[in-house]
Interface confidence: medium
């Protein structure tokens, strides 16, 4: 039998195991969350399934994940949303240690997908593991893209009081429009929900001189948000490690100056 | 593959120089901060200095303060270590391994040994 | 003498649990992140644990933590592998320098 013709794309293929990790972290998630509990994992499976299985991966649109986005839906107390940019390993351990806050990845959609890649092709019920769409090379609307696009949608829609946000200070676009919290999150927020976004500009090292919230795309950024009428704050994190630490232990004495 | 690659270490006499070099692949070199940190024969490690992102700001071992100079050429990708004076003390491997702020020194290069004797 | 104190030696059988301990003061353990390296015979450190956190390719047998001015590394699960040198560091307020323990040398029996 003639091997199948498959379509060769430039990304990477379908992350291994990719059903079974989605089940095990639907599983998962819902243990540690109970107000998560009543979640059928099985049709959580099947909705992520049916969004991308069968479907040409260069046509993919948000309306295919909505059956998906309807099961995970989830509510984020006011003031507690952490958004970010370039910068995910911090804002995720920020998460860990402030438990009241929530990126994406803390939610149960986000949690499901981070650091994953898949895809299927055409008219099969097979998932491709050798190759999928990548981004820049081949299209936009891929699997992986557009579910980052449409929970990323979601999560700024519903978001509500003041609303943070994690940047990149080593960048040399601090604030990137074509970044996902640039191009989707930002003009998602809600002006009658959301009183204020508020910037926290993480510096790469010990250099404290440089105030980064006066950087060109920071002030970008300002206008941005003032433009939609939303109250615009910015801080510099100088000390990204003190930074993490004060959260854990905001009583100590190394604390009571400047982070 | 991201990784450092340490040189210059020899054999030199008590009150002589050498420089060390580290050369850094496969990571954006000019968003880390970078050190020096060095192990005698059969003892633990120890710190012997820091080099911020752009080279704003270093620190020294008070061991090594006024005799060793750290700099960084961000557009080579390279970490250097000017050692000045000498001394039997200084015998060890010198390592240099790279720093972001909430990571820890997570890429360390090979070492190169350096060996101060009469 | 180190400015972070760790015991010297450790040992235990394949399957145990092992915790290594460091104790140091207010200006680096406290007051800043851990970091706990292993250094294996004959090669360089390597970053086991940051924040309490272990970096990809780190198994989850190892784990930080802290509490005040001490901070300690547990490992189950012994395995052979595990055999080799590990080091606590921080940074050190009072000093403006990164300080490490003196190393503990894990024997599995």
């Known amino acids: 039998v003639l091997p199948r013709w498959r379509q060769q794309w430039s990304g990477s293929g379908t992350t291994s195991r990719f059903p079974e990790t989605v089940l095990a972290r639907c599983v998962k998630y819902t243990e540690v969350h109970p107000e998560m509990r009543h979640v059928d994992c099985q049709s959580v499976w099947d909705a992520f399934k049916g969004a991308f299985i069968s479907k040409y991966p260069c046509n993919i649109t948000e309306e295919d994940y909505q059956p998906l986005v309807k099961l995970g839906t989830q509510t984020v107390p006011c003031n507690k949303t952490l958004l970010w940019s370039r910068i995910k390993d911090l804002a995720h351990q920020f998460t860990q240690v402030q438990r009241d806050m929530f990126t994406l990845e803390d939610m149960l959609l986000g949690y499901l997908a981070d650091d994953l890649t898949w895809c299927g092709e055409f008219n099969t019920f097979e998932i491709n593991y050798q190759s999928c769409p990548d981004w820049r090379k081949d299209c936009s609307n891929n699997p992986v893209s557009v579910f980052w696009k449409t929970v990323s949608r979601r999560f700024a829609e519903t978001a509500c009081g003041v609303v943070h946000v994690m940047l990149n200070g080593s960048r040399s676009k601090i604030f990137d429009k074509n970044s996902t919290f640039g191009s989707v999150e930002v003009h998602n927020l809600q002006p009658e929900k959301v009183q204020a976004l508020e910037a926290w500009v993480i510096h790469g090292g010990r250099e404290d001189s440089r105030d980064l919230c006066q950087d060109p795309t920071i002030k970008e950024l300002e206008s941005i948000i003032s433009k939609r009428n939303i109250r615009f704050f910015c801080k510099n994190i100088y000390r990204p490690d003190k930074f993490l630490q004060c959260v854990k232990n905001p009583e100590d004495s190394s604390c009571l100056s400047g982070i | 593959e991201v990784q450092l690659l340490e040189s210059g270490g020899g054999l030199v006499q008590p009150g002589g120089s050498l420089r060390l070099s580290c050369a850094a692949f496969?990571?954006?070199?000019?968003?880390?901060?970078m050190n020096w940190v060095r192990q005698a024969p059969g003892k633990g490690l120890e710190w012997v200095s820091s080099i911020s992102i752009t080279g704003s700001w270093t620190g020294y071992a008070d061991s090594v303060k006024g005799r060793f100079t750290i700099s960084r050429d961000n557009s080579k990708n390279t970490l250097y270590l000017q050692m000045n004076n000498l001394r039997a003390e200084d015998t060890a491997v010198y390592y240099c391994a790279n720093y972001k702020s909430y990571y820890g020194m997570d890429v360390w290069g090979q070492g190169t040994t350096v060996t101060v004797s009469s | 003498q180190s400015v972070l104190t760790q015991p010297p030696s450790a040992s235990g059988t394949p399957g145990q649990r092992v915790t290594i301990s460091c104790s140091g003061s207010?200006?680096?353990?406290?007051?800043?992140?851990v970091n706990w390296y292993q250094q294996l015979p004959g090669t360089a450190p390597k970053l086991l644990i940051y924040n309490a956190q272990r970096p990809s390719g780190v198994p989850d047998r190892f784990s930080g933590s802290k509490s005040g001015t001490s901070a300690s590394l547990a490992i189950s699960g012994l395995q052979s592998e595990d055999e080799a040198d590990y080091y606590c560091a921080a940074w050190d307020d009072s000093l403006n320098a990164w300080v490490f323990g003196g190393g503990t040398k894990l024997t599995v029996l």
């Open positions: 207010s200006s680096n353990i406290r007051n800043n992140l």
């Open positions: 496969g990571f954006t070199f000019s968003d880390y901060e």
